[in-house]
């Protein structure tokens, strides 16, 4: 018999949608085999209509696809639009069509149930409203207008315009009779139940002359979206509920083995500690369309989500939800890079961000994320190069070392500065990551000066020592400016008004400025790298006034004070000055930081090369 | 929570027929996959079929001992799920449980389901 395993009997109704699951043994070979979905003719012949080569008949075009989960030894088969045309025997299977490796699969689908004559079909997701539309003729314009629900052989007054309602429609029941003329009353169901599925009988009149008209209620649960991401990527949940419950609270749930739904977040301001750092609730637009993003997935995210609305920020029968059954793949696109990064007060962290190396192009984002209420995380730097402003001279965002990964390096550090931060870009959003920087007991490896005052027309040395573990690294100092960090020349570059020498012995790196120079004020960073990966770095100020006899040595900068408007990360990225706008919404007006105009321009940087879950910063 | 109470059970002779149900009650959400299994005397727990649903779309799953015998079905009005077997043979002699789960990885897997009930006896004698 064969090992490939999946449904014999699969049964529908036109219209719908079918994801047919197959398991394979998940040897090495069959993992990475060609996978077929084949529709067996009369000649006993199998014609591939989808496969995981990419290929798609022309009859399956924009309504099949074909996924492989080589971790879990399953591809899933998705056919949507189905028509009663494609009732009929398949295989699922690996490799050629005519081999053995495939299992049998019989697809049946129907018309849906009979129903009687001139029925009106309503379909309709639970919780959501539904009006039935009730013609009459004139004659019963002044009589009484009813609606029953047909149970077996039986009629169950439902409502009626005597100000009769059933107990099971309370509060959630009306029935409209228009003005004059109109000869249609309607009925309204709000908050549907699936027990209100079923054939109802709206009737004006009595006696023979009545006017009645069947209508068959369809109340549907969800049918939940299958999601696919990939594991250490990011999830959007888009959940549009409706004008109805616009302002009512909203949540997102997850069902549990008890078949009850855990809220994960709502805008009640509850979350799931599972998701601390690594969800935002996104602002609801006007229609009470919300989303909620999930970042740094992991396989125990996998699950069937629920989205609604509830005055209680949770699941309850009756009311509008959206349903999605999340699969995490293991065989992921994106790399693995540390999700925890530790530094010491004083010194620093590098911190290596993944994105999507089809899209080198993409702006480059970084922000913090905070967990009051829905969260948000606003913007603390871009490729670009705008910082906000209370990150002057202590962060910055490097394209180094480039083909899928950027680098933000942040010194000066506090344990103000622990949390998580977001990597991100305006392009595929599944490439979002977060990262955990924790501020740990030690001293800065990189030592410098405090600030550092300058006198125009002399000589500055500044010194910065490092210990003899990085004595293999490459040295170098940077003057600092909201779009990088511009490289210093060495001294073997030719003569220049700044180079750096180093005197290995005494593991040493000098900064000299000669003469100082008004455009020398600024933060400058000494740092350590070993090729395009970026290690420690410390900052110092210098400032830059005239000779005067008497003059204090150390010159501590004004720190800026937070921006009063930021921007800040929603469901979508764009860029600045409303190019390329994928969702308006992303940002508020950000304050930045002026360039000083003194820079060439570009930058060198690049990021630590630690591949561990855990990536040091400077340690003791 | 979920109870599952089957019935059904009993003894007969080989090629006969048996029908087994199995009433789902106190359900907080949709069910969505319902299975029979049965562990014959001295052997583990074995998949026996499956009925999977969402929407107006079902899923049937069989063991290859089993196909073209036993059909699997359901009344969703009365919450339940059938198993009738058709062309009995002593080596289906065994206990057949009920089981159900919201979401199963692997229909075949019976660590996969959630809830379980208490079983019922099928003795086929030759």
């Known amino acids: 018999k064969s090992p490939v395993f999946g449904p014999q009997e699969v049964s529908s109704v036109e219209g719908n949608s079918v994801s047919i699951k197959c398991y394979y043994p998940p040897t090495s070979v069959n993992r990475h085999t060609r996978k077929y979905w084949c529709r067996k003719g009369a000649s006993g012949r199998c014609i591939t209509l989808v496969s995981s080569e990419g290929y798609v008949s022309s009859n399956y075009a924009g309504r099949a696809n074909l996924t492989n989960f080589p971790e879990n030894g399953t591809f899933v088969v998705n056919i949507a639009q189905l028509s009663r045309d494609d009732s009929g025997h398949y295989k699922c299977g690996l490799g050629i069509n005519s081999r053995g490796l495939s299992f049998d699969v019989s697809l049946e689908v129907s018309q849906g149930p009979e129903l009687p004559n001139g029925t009106e079909v309503y379909t309709v997701d639970v919780g959501r409203t539904v009006t039935i539309k009730c013609p009459f003729k004139t004659e019963n314009a002044p009589k009484t207008k009813a609606l029953y629900k047909k149970i077996g052989q039986t009629s169950v007054l439902v409502i009626d315009s005597r100000n009769y309602v059933n107990p099971n429609y309370k509060d959630r029941i009306r029935l409209r009779i228009p003005g004059t003329g109109q000869l249609i009353f309607t009925v309204v169901i709000d908050r549907l139940r699936l027990s209100d599925h079923g054939l109802y009988l709206c009737q004006a009149g009595d006696g023979s002359n009545r006017d009645e008209k069947n209508a068959d209620l369809q109340v549907l649960e969800p049918e939940p979206e299958l999601v696919y991401e990939d594991l250490r990527g990011s999830v959007t949940f888009h959940c549009a509920l409706g004008l109805e419950v616009a302002n009512v609270a909203k949540f997102l749930c997850r069902v549990n083995s008890r078949e009850t739904c855990d809220v994960v977040i709502n805008t009640l301001g509850k979350r799931d500690s599972a998701f601390e750092g690594r969800i935002l609730l996104n602002p609801q637009d006007k229609d009470g369309s919300f989303s909620v993003v999930i970042t740094g997935l992991r396989k125990e995210d996998e699950g069937r989500y629920l989205c609604g609305a509830h005055s209680d920020g949770q699941l309850q029968e009756g009311w509008p939800i959206q349903a999605w059954q999340l699969f995490v793949n293991e065989e992921s696109t994106i790399p693995r890079s540390p999700t925890v990064v530790k530094g010491v007060a004083g010194g620093s962290v590098a911190v290596l961000c993944p994105y999507n190396p089809k899209e080198s192009q993409s702006l480059k984002y970084w922000c913090l994320w905070e967990g009051a209420q829905n969260g948000r995380c606003p913007l603390l730097v871009e490729s670009q190069g705008l910082v906000q402003e209370q990150y002057e001279g202590r962060l910055s965002l490097l394209q180094e070392p480039g083909n899928g990964t950027f680098t933000v390096i942040l010194n000066q550090l506090t344990t103000q500065d622990a949390g998580f931060y977001w990597c991100l870009t305006n392009g595929d959003t599944r490439w979002r990551t977060t990262v955990e920087i924790k501020i740990i007991e030690g001293e800065p490896n990189l030592k410098v000066p405090g600030n550092v005052t300058a006198v125009l027309g002399e000589t500055l040395n500044i010194p910065c020592h490092f210990p003899c573990k990085f004595s293999s690294y490459e040295k170098y100092w940077c003057k600092w400016s909201n779009t990088g960090c511009q490289t210093l020349p060495s001294q073997d570059e030719g003569p220049s008004e700044a180079f750096v020498n180093c005197d290995e012995n005494s593991r040493l790196v000098s900064l000299t400025l000669n003469p100082v120079t008004r455009a020398d004020e600024g933060w400058y960073w000494c740092g350590v790298k070993q090729g395009h990966f970026y290690g420690e770095t410390a900052a110092v100020y210098v400032a830059v006034e005239e000779k005067k006899v008497a003059g204090s040595r150390y010159v501590s900068p004004a720190k800026a004070d937070a921006a009063p408007d930021e921007k800040v990360l929603d469901s979508g990225v764009r860029e600045i000055e409303n190019k390329a706008i994928q969702d308006p919404r992303l940002f508020a007006e950000e304050k930045v930081v002026a360039d000083t105009g003194d820079q060439a321009g570009g930058s060198r940087a690049s990021v630590d090369s630690s591949s561990s879950e855990e990536q040091g910063g400077s340690s003791k | 929570q979920v109870q599952l109470v089957e019935s059904g059970g009993g003894l007969v002779q080989a090629g006969d027929s048996l029908r087994l149900s199995c009433a789902a009650s106190?359900?907080?959400?949709?069910?969505?996959?319902m299975g029979w299994f049965r562990q014959p005397p001295g052997k583990e727990r074995e998949f026996v079929a499956t009925i999977s649903w969402s929407g107006s779309t079902t899923y049937k799953y069989y063991a290859d001992s089993v196909k073209g015998r036993f059909t699997i079905s359901r009344d969703n009005a009365k919450n339940t799920v059938y198993l009738q077997m058709n062309s009995l043979k002593p080596e289906d002699t065994a206990v057949y449980y009920c089981a159900a789960s919201t979401v199963v990885a692997d229909p075949r897997a019976p660590n996969e389901y959630d809830y379980w009930g208490q079983g019922t006896q099928v003795t086929v004698s030759s």
């Open positions: 106190g359900r907080t959400f949709t069910t969505y996959v």
